[in-house]
Amino acid sequence: GPVWRKHYITYRINNYTPDMNREDVDYAIRKAFQVWSNVTPLKFSKINTGMADILVVFARGAHGDFHAFDGKGGILAHAFGPGSGIGGDAHFDEDEFWTTHSGGTNLFLTAVHEIGHSLGLGHSSDPKAVMFPTYKYVDINTFRLSADDIRGIQSLYGDPKENQRLPNPDNSEPALCDPNLSFDAVTTVGNKIFFFKDRFFWLKVSERPKTSVNLISSLWPTLPSGIEAAYEIEARNQVFLFKDDKYWLISNLRPEPNYPKSIHSFGFPNFVKKIDAAVFNPRFYRTYFFVDNQYWRYDERRQMMDPGYPKLITKNFQGIGPKIDAVFYSKNKYYYFFQGSNQFEYDFLLQRITKTLKSNSWFGC
């Protein structure tokens, strides 16, 4: 199922139930999000205006989706899995009597369950799990997620120690030699390697220890921060940069006009909303696009996807996956795959990992 592809997630309370004080609603919702942030790398922040990832709504009857509420009892609430628009939103039936305690329906407990759905969890068959489909009051002061809930959410997002790998909320320059440093995208550009992270990129000139940090906007003012994938076709002096469902073409280090364009022009199906990583192999003249736990192969000569894709990363790149953050091609036989703070040198002729490194090993740390 879908997951959020970022770790900083915003929520907004669209309206308040008259059953409770506003502060109690705010507190119940905040604590419900905290239950999930305590066991994952996710960070939640409340916003009061604008488009949030997760919209919390109290409504009765028909309320703008295909799932009208049914009056008191029955369906208490529902939530949509991660995605744009209605994706992630949590709806609470206003015909219930929402409370901070055991009377009526406890908002905190219901919200923990619904936020689980908002994050991509389905129902659990374990009656002790908060994701079990039926509501049962438990003491909120001693409430704990079950092992099944934790297993489920960590299978989607990992555990909290991955917090250190996240983009800085203040967008300050990441510490280059932080052992937990991860990258958003990596690509060669001629004899240099570009490492992208948030608003920044590091430039590594091959075989030289010195690296310099730059703002992406200082080199390419028209490009966004948070580049998610990148690859180079050196013979054409072209670099492709990807963010969300758009890509930019850089020729001879200059952005081409009439970009960005949609990634769907490569032939991706509509459900692909972003690219995690990409790499061009000049030997085969093919580009590999990594999306979630799958990859596509694109024929750069014929300008079309090869048939038979997508394929599972783990099936065809032994020891890599299920997902990757970045990848680049080097020395005519290696892919360097980045997964969080780890990096894997992968010999594509032998089809195996030949070295495991830290992601920032290129910087003499």
Epitope: P2, L55, H63, G64, D65, F66, H67, I86
Partner: antibody, heavy 122, light 103 residues
Amino acid sequence: EVQLLESGGGLVQPGGSLRLSCAASGFTFSWYNMSWVRQAPGKGLEWVSRISPSGGDTGYADSVKGRFTISRDNSKNTLYLQMNSLRAEDTAVYYCAKDIRGAYSGGLFDYWGRGTLVTVSS
Amino acid sequence: DIQMTQSPSSLSASVGDRVTITCRANQSIYTYLNWYQQKPGKAPELLIYAASSLQSGVPSRFSGSGSGTDFTLTISSLQPEDFATYYCQQAGIFGQGTKLEIK
């Protein structure tokens, strides 16, 4: 490439029955909500029915409730609409539409078929 | 029940014009509103979802705005291929449509 191809339309007498099919390809059919939407000649769009990915959850417009039944066969990548007790006002082009979402449906249709014409007349 | 009222029902404009179509719900639908374009004899095509998000492949001259009960679709500079009928939609409810014709 996502493709939806409706079939089964035609001329039928009032009170008669018809079964529409929609063959889907180019996406994982069993992951998505699907809907039928119709358009009477010269009129606007009217949502008719929807079905969840597993087929366990369905919904209908009031105008067809009790007369139409939506179903799907995920092994055949096919969506169906069984239409009984047809009336003149059911005359329309019937479109099969793919919802952008699995699980709960927000009713956002990113792909549509070309439609099949159903004419109810004596 | 939720109802959607679209206006105007028809509109004449020229190539290069800026055009606005509005859609009003009788109760809040948050940002759960979509816009479709339909050309004669063709199936509808998704233009805008979640009130303001542009569907991939749709030209940037199309934009959407609004939340709650009032929504607008704007075409910043009409092109010949934009003459069509436009529908707003929320779950199982469509607006009546706006036919955009050449002046």
